[in-house]
Interface confidence: low
Amino acid sequence: FNISGCSTKKLLWTYSTRSEEEFVLFCDLPEPQKSHFCHRNRLSPKQVPEHLPFMGSNDLSDVQWYQQPSNGDPLEDIRKSYPHIIQDKCTLHFLTPGVNNSGSYICRPKMIKSPYDVACCVKMILEVKPQTNASCEYSASHKQDLLLGSTGSISCPSLSCQSDAQSPAVTWYKNGKLLSVERSNRIVVDEVYDYHQGTYVCDYTQSDTVSSWTVRAVVQVRTIVGDTKLKPDILDPVEDTLEVELGKPLTISCKARFGFERVFNPVIKWYIKDSDLEWEVSVPEAKSIKSTLKDEIIERNIILEKVTQRDLRRKFVCFVQNSIGNTTQSVQLKEKRG
């Protein structure tokens, strides 16, 4: 198709080499089309035109994204050629930063249903640059936490070094929807609820004598509870003795509940005591079996190929630890009678 009629937008992604971050492109179709097509309506209901020139489908996945190779080759379908780029409805997600993401991206509806639709496309020229050392050293992170029930704020990483007075007007999106009221480089949240969690995008315009660019940054915000004040507790084993059959295989499970910690370094391990000797068991690995906002349950097993008489003299100890402290639970094997 002829892309000369596509509306054009220039975007700049300045990424930090110190942290992982993502980026998004929205299929910014002309306003009426977009409101009908992508459900990302920036207009108030009163402003929606009665007649929509673009008769797009309401199926949000019916957008096609292409990349325009710089050497003049034909357009490439994003889904086929770029595994680190994911299409989600009308949004293109870049999972990894890098200058190789620079280029021209075109989106348009898959289905053309009226003569007006031919020019219903948008071309985004994306420039990707690593942040220079001269940039602000303490810029806001692309992963930000909000403490549930308290006051918090979400900062635009590319503007967090500027005072509110210096800051240009910022356009914010949350999960692809425009936050029409927010215009500053910081969103202040009076009381944090779990629905404040999500992907936030902040845009501002940067101009030079030749052209203007939209500078964009993406912030992943999670809502968290306060760090636990408790050491982990062992849910299983409960008993300190376990009846076993000699010669049979045995798996002993240790399950422990760890309270939420922002910096989470849980330790769960088995070790074995036999007279004055103690030894740790390093396999199999621990696995998380349940994760909630407040806590995580982690399990680690110890596997005996077959129980021997010698095992009955040993103590099998599960040791769990977080930043607050540690807990242990020991198990002695006892031969099953009868």
Epitope: V267, K269, Y271, I272, D274, S275, D276, L277, E278, W279, E280, V281, S282, V283, P284, I303, L304, E305, T308, D311
Partner: antibody, heavy 117, light 110 residues
Framework: SVEESGGRLVTPGGSLTLTCTVS????????MSWVRQAPGKGLEWIGI?????NTYYASWAKGRFTISKTSTTVDLKITSPATGDTATYFC???????????????WGPGTLVTVSS | DVVMTQTPASASAAVGGTVTINCQAS??????LAWYQQKPGQPPKLLIY???ALASGVPSRFKGSGSGTEFALTISDLECDDAAIYYC????????????FGGGTEVVVK
């Protein structure tokens, strides 16, 4: 990864400490062992330090070698080295594996100690 | 300490052939035995633990067997890259029986 250092030419009767530096290994979870190999000879197990800091030595090595650790290093101190202690000294992570058996799963390249007058 | 005796001191076979190395423990060590491969200028590499369990990334051409006091390592479909010295190690978890290695067997591939 595991890397030994400190190997050098030493005179008999002196004292020498070899250091094993680990990265990506939590020494509060894994046991580390020292093994040596005289030129052209076989492997000789010296001793081991467990996650909790307990040390165990081969009967021939008791009193002559001391193993200790910090959060990222494991040291082997050789007291009064003799010419028979000339060898490449390896440091290895010993994992306690399924079936209550242990084995050296990750080894350093070794460091050469030469004891000579 | 448990004494580990390896035989033969040297074994040779042609490419594609099979070689068997034996290891004898001076007392019953159940299945607590490991096998390592060592090439010149390199540290040992774990092949087998628990007498017969294959370590991660080791081809199934390497087969460990035995228990108690008699053990064997069999290498089939020999490749040139298998030329090395092979050691058995007692890995019995006992305060008096740590870690003894066998004397080693040199495998030559013709």
């Amino acid at each position: 990864s595991v890397e030994e250092s400190g190997g050098r030419l030493v005179t008999p009767g002196g004292s020498l400490t070899l250091t094993c530096t680990v990265s990506g290994i939590d020494l509060s979870v894994y046991a580390m062992s020292w093994v040596r190999q005289a030129p052209g000879k076989g492997l000789e197990w010296i001793g081991i330090i467990t996650f909790s800091g307990n040390t165990y030595y081969a009967s021939w090595a008791k009193g002559r070698f001391t193993i200790s650790k910090t959060s990222t290093t494991v040291d082997l101190k050789i007291t009064s080295p003799a010419t028979g202690d000339t060898a490449t000294y390896f440091c290895a992570r010993f994992d306690f594996l399924v079936g209550l058996t242990y084995a050296g799963v990750l080894w350093g390249p070794g460091t050469l100690v030469t004891v000579s007058s | 300490d448990v004494v580990m005796t390896q035989t033969p001191a040297s074994a040779s076979a042609a490419v594609g052939g099979t070689v068997t190395i034996n290891c004898q423990a001076s007392e019953n060590i159940a299945n607590h035995l490991a096998w390592y491969q060592q090439k010149p200028g390199q540290p040992p590499k774990l092949l087998i633990y628990s007498a017969s369990a294959l370590a991660s990334g080791v081809p199934s051409r390497f087969k460990g067997s035995g228990s108690g006091t008699e053990f064997a390592l069999t290498i089939s479909d020999l490749e040139c890259d298998d030329a090395a010295i092979y050691y058995c190690q007692c890995t019995f978890w006992d305060i008096n029986n740590f870690g003894g290695f066998g004397g080693g067997t040199e495998v030559v591939v013709k």
